[in-house]
Amino acid sequence: KSSNEATNITPKHNMKAFLDELKAENIKKFLYNFTQIPHLAGTEQNFQLAKQIQSQWKEFGLDSVELAHYDVLLSYPNKTHPNYISIINEDGNEIFNTSLFEPPPPGYENVSDIVPPFSAFSPQGMPEGDLVYVNYARTEDFFKLERDMKINCSGKIVIARYGKVFRGNKVKNAQLAGAKGVILYSDPADYFAPGVKSYPDGWNLPGGGVQRGNILNLNGAGDPLTPGYPANEYAYRRGIAEAVGLPSIPVHPIGYYDAQKLLEKMGGSAPPDSSWRGSLKVPYNVGPGFTGNFSTQKVKMHIHSTNEVTRIYNVIGTLRGAVEPDRYVILGGHRDSWVFGGIDPQSGAAVVHEIVRSFGTLKKEGWRPRRTILFASWDAEEFGLLGSTEWAEENSRLLQERGVAYINADSSIEGNYTLRVDCTPLMYSLVHNLTKELKSPDEGFEGKSLYESWTKKSPSPEFSGMPRISKLGSGNDFEVFFQRLGIASGRARYTKNWETNKFSGYPLYHSVYETYELVEKFYDPMFKYHLTVAQVRGGMVFELANSIVLPFDCRDYAVVLRKYADKIYSISMKHPQEMKTYSVSFDSLFSAVKNFTEIASKFSERLQDFDKSNPIVLRMMNDQLMFLERAFIDPLGLPDRPFYRHVIYAPSSHNKYAGESFPGIYDALFDIESKVDPSKAWGEVKRQIYVAAFTVQAAAETLSEVA
């Protein structure tokens, strides 16, 4: 049954009332308000915005709104000693320097405290040497360089284009290859869509625009100095040498005008194939070093950024549940931005603000949700998901016992083509049912449902007539809730057409040009896509907090487990001889998946038939649903990644943004043909199959009849 059975309900107080209260014009106003100055984590401006949001959430009617502060490791450029890269001649003279900052967008020329482009947490250093172009710096790019082309990156400065994978993975790969510095740049092939003007005339990246971002490899640790525990007043902090995930070599980002000057002189090997060529008028030679006439010139990095323990502030709002106040549905998104945050994060924060206002309006009229809803404005997401992770570490005991679901609310848009959803399989049916009830904002789909336009534009690759829903990866604040704590999670936003726009993310991501005007002029002038995202996110929260039976379908987990087992088995079967030699069998995993499928099916039948008027039985069934996600958590975590504990999903070891299924087995199999000790390697594969099979079986048993 749905929400209209919720507590204190009157005909007026249902999902429709909540959705009808959401207004595009309010989201627009909130976005404007949140984007007039920078809100960098750890700054006074972001503290002031936290207090403003606290005050407004109270006005909107939440029961309580508190600030939760932590002292975490952040990173900033040196104000008097700017970071830059130069080309130096044989005498050591700088004959070319990269930009010190981006040219400001129109109307923002007099804004102070715009942080110049930098790679957060880069160590200081002034390495100089020959350049090697490493494409996207993915694992496979370094394989191509080292194994096929026999190019050694040791002692070289590598230049990599942004895109395809998380920048932290690029830096980790470069470090492992022996590089002594990394230059990251935005190639027009990835950040300039054909036929669109650059900002301020369109939504493309100008030549002087640069993507900021952290380059950590935290693997879910949160604050690098206090892994596993909150960075509170009495925290024990590691020394910087023991800090988690910090890069060991200097890193700096540049725009494509500056990249042109570095790449145009490149000599050495030609690019291995066309996939290594971007859109600049340069040869994309790999190097090492510059061509003939310029061979005595070197590249020098000048990096002077500092790491500093700094106070950050989350805003936590509570709307107490009327029936199950000890069950928490969380809606959270970050507040800190690199500069103005026109899209990331404020297009999401503005939507959260309007959702809070709508819930508050209903509450003022006497309504309460069945379960408690927690609203969060996270700090320091851009510096490694720090605010959300520290809060979850501080409240982990409550969350693991009471956490029903977490809905993420970062950027509401990355395009204006169709909906994009990543979530636990438990939420598939919730998302399908909700989007069938919402109107599509898309041109050509007037009067049609969101489900219909979404399915048409982004069809599921497996199931006809259904939309694509992706796996959760990481790179956002749901990470600690899903990957560490096993709380069912989901995220939704409007996206671009991935078929026609192959660029990575959106072109102005993390640049100074991510302004209110970018959104209002080019992405969503009517704020209709923002409103739709508010309806999806808010609608999911409403249903999760209000429906008598939790809107989770465990049968959908059974379906994907079978698909993931088939996939990992087929990867393993690329090595049939070794599987035979080392007696590798997936029987236990397939058996566990079969058992899960049968038990989930029976549970779903019982769910239809049980007496919902019996509060004890209702609570028991809901707890089985709530704790199902938790059952996929292995307390020991994944190998070398103790904070990634979900056995079914983890961020890819090669790209933090992407989700990998059965990650323990996947990583054990990855590049196994190159392992020096095959017996040991295949032994680890067998161990990971065992862990996965056990976990799936154990999870299945949580759905069995209790006695």
Epitope: T98, S99, F101, P103, P104, K197, D201, P206, G207
Partner: antibody, heavy 119, light 107 residues
């Protein structure tokens, strides 16, 4: 090849208006900004403003706000700069110059139009 | 507005000389500085943009350097065709502003 051809010299009385044209050829007209820069006799260069033919946006230097208007005729790939309420200090050579984008330097210039303001 | 100050105002030099002109900005303009050459009765001609990027067709004896607030234009070996007035201009922030010019004349 890229060419910016400006209209001929003008002599105007104080208080009058002048409209100088700049006809572009050899490139896609709407892909480039058009700037106007003036130079008083024996003096340096002074930026007056730009016109963006892609979206008809203009930006004028504070000094000329309210007196200058920049327009276009797409059919002839021509940009116009009109300066009103002329005074003797407006006697100068007026140049149009194009730039690739909002942040790019002016790579091609017109030959200049001499405007003399005299009673 | 950003003030641009050039020095010297006039420079006397001979063919073959190495010539350096300095341009200072009243606040940091990163590397967004252009240099133009103007001959009497002619329109300015772009030599260098973004501090050090040589415009195509401009002889390699012209070079630009600098970052932040201090920039220089260098002519490595002055040629007869180089006697002209040179202007710097910041192209990072509107209104765009020029230096007052440096006249390079024959010694």
């Amino acid at each position: 090849q890229v060419q910016l051809v400006q209209s001929g010299a003008e002599v105007k009385k104080p208080g009058a208006s002048v409209k100088v044209s700049c006809k572009a050829s050899g490139y896609t007209f709407t892909d480039y900004y058009m700037h106007w820069v003036r130079q008083a006799p024996g003096q340096g260069l002074e930026w007056m403003g730009y016109f963006n033919p892609y979206n008809d946006y203009t930006r004028y230097a504070q000094k000329f706000q309210g007196r200058v208007t920049m327009t276009r005729d797409t059919s002839t790939s021509t940009v116009y700069m009109e300066l009103s309420s002329l005074r003797s200090e407006d006697t100068a050579v007026y140049y149009c110059a194009r730039s690739d984008g909002y942040y790019d330097a002016m790579d091609y210039w017109g030959q200049g139009t001499t405007v003399t303001v005299s009673s | 507005d950003i003030q641009m100050t050039q020095s010297p105002s006039t420079l006397s030099a001979s063919v073959g000389d190495r010539v350096t002109i300095t341009c200072r900005a009243s606040k940091s303009i990163s590397k967004y500085l252009a240099w133009y050459q103007q001959k009497p009765g002619k329109a300015p001609k772009l030599l260098i943009h973004s501090g050090s990027s040589l415009e195509s067709g401009v002889p390699s004896r012209f070079s630009g350097s600098g970052s932040g607030t201090e920039f220089t234009l260098t002519i490595s070996s002055l040629q007869p065709d180089d006697f002209a007035t040179y202007y710097c201009q910041q192209h990072i922030e509107y209104p765009w502003t020029f230096g007052q010019g440096t006249k390079v004349e024959i010694k």
